[in-house]
Amino acid sequence: MDSFNYTTPDYGHYDDKDTLDLNTPVDKTSNTLRVPDILALVIFAVVFLVGVLGNALVVWVTAFEAKRTINAIWFLNLAVADFLSCLALPILFTSIVQHHHWPFGGAACSILPSLILLNMYASILLLATISADRFLLVFKPIWCQNFRGAGLAWIACAVAWGLALLLTIPSFLYRVVREEYFPPKVLCGVDYSHDKRRERAVAIVRLVLGFLWPLLTLTICYTFILLRTWSRRATRSTKTLKVVVAVVASFFIFWLPYQVTGIMMSFLEPSSPTFLLLKKLDSLCVSFAYINCCINPIIYVVAGQGFQGRLRKSLPSLLRNVLTEESVVRESKSFTRSTVDTMAQKTQAV
């Protein structure tokens, strides 16, 4: 056989109506956005509007108080992390609208999603720090009277940001722009290619340090705090309980889909049907997690209204009342003057 019997393949199903609108070839299936992507866009839009305005207001209120009020330091850092994350949303929104096409270049692909991840980790780690602060206020009030100062709070925040930066490095290093040949599309994502073990390691570290560990910290801290509060018959124990339940529940609700899909995808073959299904849900999971970036200002306002009975004050003064009230350190009243201090934990960011 000198040459293979090359017969023209059967393209009977292919007619002129099927011809690509041939100047800009596009996959037929990609003309309309998938339902998960549409939902993600709606969430992104709402989160952006509420998150930018709300967190900007929180930053404005807390910035002036951060020198003298420790709670203001916590809220300021959380709001900055959330605010920065929200600023990246228009880019993510644009990419999804364009069927995940990334027209922003290689540098933006490396930096921008990594920056978002940095802020996500920073928020989670700051929450763990705040939880530790709540714990110490209840169980080590004397120590707090002696050592709990603004300087230490800023150091704790710096450590949280530094650790967040370290956790973000793998994402930065492995993030690449890939230009697909057909349909013509530039994609931004991580590519571990030959190193599946490293991909899994990164996913496991992300799950443990970005989800399980903060969750454990919060649960343990608040279990002890609640037990102490109940034993002292604190007047606001019911309200505190509700806040704690909200904190833990929201942590689960908003982060579980993101983390579960992330860990599953790292253990699946990229061409497997399950992987492809999870990939279609990826944007929705990210947008769901992003709700954390806008929820805090809402909680502060709701909490503020709760304490005031009804919204009599202006929004800035209401927030100032909620966010800058310093904790009272007394053994007999080891909880804080304001339940909103505990409510601050709600800021579960990405």
């Epitope: 023209t8 393209y11 040949y181 590519d191």
Partner: antibody, heavy 125, light 112 residues
Framework: QVQLQQSGAELAKPGASVKLSCKTS????????MHWIKQRPGLGLEWIGY????????KHNQKFKDKATLTADRSSSTAYMQLSSLTYEDSAVYYC??????????????????WGQGTTLTVSS | DVVMTQTPLSLPVSLGDHASISCRSS???????????LHWYLQRPGQSPKLLIH???NRFSGVPDRFSGSGSGTDFTLKISRVEAEDVGIYFC?????????FGSGTKLELK
Amino acid sequence: QVQLQQSGAELAKPGASVKLSCKTSGYTFTNYWMHWIKQRPGLGLEWIGYINPSGDYTKHNQKFKDKATLTADRSSSTAYMQLSSLTYEDSAVYYCARVPLSYGSGNGPYYFDYWGQGTTLTVSS
Amino acid sequence: DVVMTQTPLSLPVSLGDHASISCRSSQSLVHSNGNIYLHWYLQRPGQSPKLLIHKVSNRFSGVPDRFSGSGSGTDFTLKISRVEAEDVGIYFCSQSTLVPLTFGSGTKLELK
């Protein structure tokens, strides 16, 4: 019978330009993209780019962006590639190859199902 | 660019032998649609290349079933179960997942 008939061997001087042709028959010209591939002895195959004959949409390998100009004449079902500012490195065999635009799960213009016989270009002073 | 690394560069075989050619890509070739666009071509002496296998493991029409392709992600293999005289030539792997499309350096199959 699908055929991609390429023009004969070319001899050109450095700095000159040359236009290679690929005349097709046996299929609907506008329903297939036409790609161009370069082959130098011992250096394997290099993708130059493609033209979509239906709308004259072209896509190049960045390496050949300023070197190759791809065009198509629908009336004669012929694809052309003009190579400009020739250097000795441009001496090679150039192939045209078509890709089927079939739809379906994962189908599309992904592989070269038919190739021309090749045109040998020699750049010499 | 995606670098396609083929091994071995030369493969001397006897008629009826099994032959195996490996191709490794520097990046994952999994397309966003889940498909892998890795193909194999054979260029016989003095001829233009001809398509053997498309999308990792699909034989092109008219290609004998002694040719088979396999692999995933970044590692791919072309196997010839019983080598015949007309199988002599240079085998190229090629990817069309990412731009620019790239080819392996080729594996020369020759008879001992």
